[in-house]
């Protein structure tokens, strides 16, 4: 807390300007009017205040707005935003995308801080859903943002927002998140033609069920191996050798190099060896010719 002291004669600040950098902390507290500060917040960023001085300015704003800052002030906080705690931010009501962008710009190049996470949470909750423009903005600043959301939070993403998602935005998503996003992507891109559809849906396929993979295998898509290996193991296992061959096209040749990794390894174990031989890759580990394959899961369901 800065002690309350009277402002020395002639030091009352008529405006926020560079002369204030020479003020001691107590002088800033005594001589800068909080209402003036609030209306001239945009000037603060241009002035090289020390961290201690910024603490005083924050204190003045906190006193003026104990229930939380208005958006007109928030939008111009600039580097003062870095002084805010998540508790401060929870009092705000940020509705403008421009305000969000301005504050994200301050934290640009850094990991997502608790302050930023709280700000985004407040903003998205205020909007009710993660719309396309918001998602566009958030993924531009934080490519991993989408994958930081829980499946429950992702369920509020409308299919129309999926158009804003870039492949790199999904790099760190786990299968549970892709399970939520894939149906939305399928809906969003449903009116596209075959090859264009595949380009768009490709990065979401980690959430695709077997029947959709089978359908894709009929469309000459030539899925690359990296995409194939991100597919759900339970979705890949029922695919036949012919279907995998059609799905991967020329990239099927790479299965040999990845035969020890999932889902390739598990899939090989499920195939008949003579079917694997048709791939021309020397893959081993399939079911020997003449063996009977029992689907135990089907048997359990019947009993």
């Amino acid at each position: 807390e800065v002690e309350k002291t009277a402002c020395p004669s002639g030091k009352k600040a008529p405006e926020i300007d560079e002369s204030l950098i020479f003020y001691k902390k107590w002088e800033l507290e005594a001589c800068v009017d909080a209402a003036l500060l609030a209306t001239q917040m945009d000037r603060v960023n241009a002035i090289p205040f020390t961290y201690e001085q910024l603490d005083v300015l924050k204190h003045k704003l906190d006193e003026l707005y104990p229930q939380g800052y208005p958006e007109s002030v928030i939008q111009h906080l600039g580097y003062l935003f870095l002084k805010m705690s998540p508790e401060d931010i929870r009092k705000w009501n940020v509705t403008s995308l421009e305000t969000l962008k301005a504050l994200l710009e301050v934290n640009k190049g850094h990991e997502m801080s608790p302050q930023v996470a709280t700000l985004i949470d407040r903003f998205v909750k205020g909007r009710g859903q993660l719309d396309k423009d918001t998602l566009d903005t958030l993924t531009a600043f934080y490519p991993g943002y989408l994958c930081s959301l829980s499946p429950e939070e992702l369920s509020s993403v409308p299919p129309s927002s999926i158009w804003a998602v870039r492949p790199q935005d999904l790099d760190t998503c786990d299968p549970r998140q892709l399970d939520v996003l894939y149906p939305k992507a399928r809906l969003a891109f449903q009116n596209m033609n075959g090859s264009e559809y595949f380009v768009k849906i490709q990065s979401f396929l980690g959430g695709a069920p077997t029947e959709d993979l089978k359908a894709l295998s009929q469309q000459n898509v030539s899925m690359d191996l990296a995409t194939f290996m991100k597919l759900r193991t339970d979705a890949v296992l029922p695919l036949t050798v012919a279907e995998v061959q059609k799905l991967l096209g020329p990239h099927v040749e790479g299965l040999k190099a990845e035969e020890r990794h999932r889902p390739v390894r598990d899939w090989i174990l499920r195939q008949r060896q003579d079917d694997l031989d048709t791939l021309g890759l020397g893959l081993q580990g399939g079911i020997p010719n003449g063996y009977l394959v029992l689907d135990l899961s089907m048997q359990e369901a019947l009993s």
């Epitope: 191996l225 290996m229 790479g254 040999k256 990845e258 021309g280 890759l281």
Partner: antibody, heavy 115, light 113 residues
Amino acid sequence: QVQLQQPGTELVTPGASVKLSCKASGYSFTSYWMHWVKQRPGQGLEWIGNINPSNGDTFYNEKFKNKATLTVDKSSSTAYMQLSSLTSEDSAVYYCARGWLRDYWGQGTTLTVSS
Amino acid sequence: DIVMTQSPSSLAVSVGQKVTMSCKSSQSLLNSSSQKNYLAWYQQKPGQSPKLLVYFASTKDSGVPDRFIGSGSGTDFTLTINSVQAEDLADYFCQQHYTTPYTFGGGTKLEIK
């Protein structure tokens, strides 16, 4: 040891076709796909396409789709590439190479298209 | 198509020197599931066919001398030759096998002073 044998040279006239061969030995022919690569003098390498010797499936670089046709003869462990409607642009060294990693290469066939 | 860019296009070094050449791809070649980069390096000596040196960006093919070292991940790759020998005079090509059409870099010509 693994060997991919290719004829050294082929001389053909413009407009004609030519069938280049690549005889494999020293490994199981149907356990590795065969790739074909083009190299023009002083220039880089271009992937033409590949073939699965086990079932004859072929895949082509779009650029060579109407130029090259890949086939195999399993009985003689030989891969073939037919090039059609030849022009001077097709004059180059053509290599066959084994598998996804291209771990073994033939010595290359120098194709000269000239009248 | 993935564009592969090699630099420098040529360089001349003395026997025993260390040499480094670069290969950049226009998109990532990393399969994050297996942590393999689908990039290979080939050596082509004058009048000969290319020979595989390194695959998966850093795995040496059998019989390749220890002085050849491949490194890098994603889009930036390097081939280093520690203590260059006279027999290393050759063109060096990188190639991606992440997606078709498989593409090669323009090559780096290594000359011995």
